[in-house]
Interface confidence: low
């Protein structure tokens, strides 16, 4: 139920493209193509084409997305598309001139002297957003999130976009400053993460984040499964990127437990994350006993 | 900063206590608490501690039997229920070291305790 | 919960010397442990947190090694004020945890 056709504007094309983008990924990483049938992965990438095709549709003259092109370009849709098409950098030809553009449009555009990134056009299906959907702390975790899009585009952009570190240290400095007075744990392990993407994870703000955590395994706000499931996946690739292979396995075993294996209305930042825990979790970790996945893929009849 | 239980008496068994564990020189709204129980001659025993916020976590022995509670940011109340003779012990109050967690940081400083004495 | 076994139970050393206690955890606790000395009639002390943290004024003779499962603490160049007992405590989690049953350390 993963593999999707995507298809609608520019923010639903997102919607649809996210679970086959993330499924291609997670099956590619964990090498478990053989069960489903190595053809399935030609048929996923070619509709992983058809949404980035798509999705340039709806690229605006600056470089940013919107989800229709007369509406005012979104920080947040852009820094997303970023997400998403430098992870499908590694599955189909992505022209690193349109994904370095938007990431040149966040940092010129977008970036306060003080680091933060301001959102002027907030998207309308709301419900794609995940936890940052909660306005509390949404400086912190807008910024934390284009950070790490940000981070995540590096490797390809570094060159193109000369301006990329020093955003990177401001969105990180800012993130710093403002860590010890979070207070939702969802903001505590996207900002967690952001700072373990650029080794600055430490106390005091190691201690935060790793007491953030409700009984060790999650970082969990009441009756919000599905940012409780976005938030935790964060912070296992902050455990992850820390080496800190002694907190990893109940966390793991928590995210395996709520078996939630993506899809359904509003699920799109809960199903890119927790595969992409997972899947970096099996990569980091070959010996995994805490994981037993019954995953299953469905590619859409034609 | 110091803390000093208060509280402590001889009971009868089934008879329910509450201990108040008082603080100076610092705010339980930025500092967590914890408790912790030594019956004679014995080793000590963790009971539970609560947060900032008022959240409170407990032993799985504990659960149910007692409560940690914030009465207001200088006194914590531990109230107990069910007692047994096999609850007799000094009760220490301690703070976390810092605002977080003391299972993770520690707890320090403590108080010097109070007695509970179960005896029919 | 999980189970900590401190060894050994007693132990003496003389001024000058090295004790070494060990604290072993029945499941892995990262480095959730600290270590507390206790003097008779008296309450617990923080000594060392999060494994190997040194507590605020605590003299840099005592020393917290480990991670996981398995924890020491050593005392290099004991002093006669050392004399107490030693008590670790490891948390899985808020409601899985618990203290080891205690070193007592004697100072000749």
């Known amino acids: 139920h993963l593999i999707v056709t995507p298809a609608g504007a520019g923010e639903q094309n997102m919607i649809g493209m996210t679970p086959t983008v993330i499924a291609v990924h997670y099956l590619d990483q964990t090498e478990q193509w053989e069960k489903f049938g190595i053809e399935k992965r030609q048929e996923a990438l070619e509709l992983i084409k058809k949404g980035y095709t798509q999705q340039l549709a709806f690229k605006q003259p600056s470089s940013a997305y919107a989800a229709f092109n007369n509406r005012p370009p979104s920080t947040w849709l852009t820094a997303y598309v970023v997400k998403v098409f430098s992870l499908a950098a590694n599955l189909i030809a992505i022209d690193s001139h349109v994904l370095c553009g938007a990431v040149k449009w966040l940092i010129l555009e977008k970036q306060k002297p003080d680091g933060v990134f301001q959102e002027d056009g907030p998207v309308i299906h709301q419900e794609m957003i995940g936890g940052f959907r909660n306005a509390k702390e949404a400086d912190v975790s807008l910024t934390a999130f284009v950070l790490i899009a940000l981070q995540e585009a590096r490797d390809i952009c570094e060159g193109q976009v000369n301006s990329l570190p020093g955003s990177i240290n401001k969105a990180g400095e800012y993130i710093e400053a403002s860590y010890m007075n979070l207070q939702r744990p969802y903001t505590v392990a996207i900002a967690g993460y952001a700072l373990a993407l650029m080794n600055k994870l430490e106390e005091p703000y190691l201690g935060k984040f790793l007491n953030t955590a409700k009984d060790r395994n999650r970082w969990e706000e009441p009756d919000q499964q599905l940012y409780n499931v976005e938030a935790t996946s964060y912070a296992l690739l902050a455990l992850l990127l820390l080496k800190d292979f002694d907190s990893v396995p109940p966390v793991v075993r928590w995210l395996n437990e709520q078996r939630y294996y993506g899809g359904g209305y509003g699920s799109t930042q809960a199903t890119f994350m927790v595969f992409q825990a997972l899947a970096q979790y099996q990569t980091d970790v070959p010996d995994h006993k805490d994981l037993n996945m019954d995953v299953s893929f469905h590619l859409p009849s034609r | 900063q110091s803390l000093e239980e208060s509280g402590g008496r001889l009971v009868t068994p089934g008879t329910p206590l509450t201990l108040t564990c008082t603080v100076s020189?610092?705010?339980?709204?930025?500092?967590?608490l914890g408790w912790v129980r030594q019956a004679p001659g014995k080793g000590l025993e963790y009971i539970g501690w609560?947060?900032?916020?008022?959240?409170a976590y407990y032993a799985s022995w504990a659960k149910g039997r007692f409560t940690i509670s914030k009465a207001s940011s200088t006194t914590v109340d531990l109230k107990m229920a069910g007692l047994t003779t096999e609850d007799t012990a000094t009760y220490f109050c301690?703070?976390?070291?810092?605002?977080?967690?003391?299972?993770?940081?520690?707890?320090?400083?403590w108080g010097p305790g109070t007695l509970v004495t179960v005896s029919s | 919960d999980p189970v900590l076994t401190q060894t050994p139970s007693s132990t003496s050393a003389a001024v000058g010397g090295t004790v070494t206690i060990k604290c072993q955890a029945s499941?892995?606790?990262?480095?959730?442990l600290a270590w507390y000395q206790q003097k008779p009639g008296q309450p617990p002390k923080l000594l060392i947190y999060?494994?190997?943290d040194l507590a605020s004024g605590v003299p840099s003779r005592f020393k917290g090694s480990g991670s996981g499962t398995q924890f020491t603490l050593t005392i290099s160049g004991v002093q006669r004020e050392d004399a107490a007992t030693y008590y670790c405590?490891?948390?899985?989690?808020?409601?899985?945890?618990?203290f080891g049953g205690g070193t007592e350390v004697v100072v000749k």
């Open positions: 301690a703070s976390g070291n810092t605002g977080g967690d003391p299972l993770y940081y520690g707890m320090d400083p």
């Open positions: 405590l490891g948390s899985y989690s808020s409601s899985d945890s618990a």
């Open positions: 999060r494994a190997s």
């Open positions: 499941q892995n606790i990262g480095r959730w």
């Open positions: 020189g610092f705010s339980l709204s930025t500092y967590t």
């Open positions: 609560i947060d900032s916020s008022g959240s």
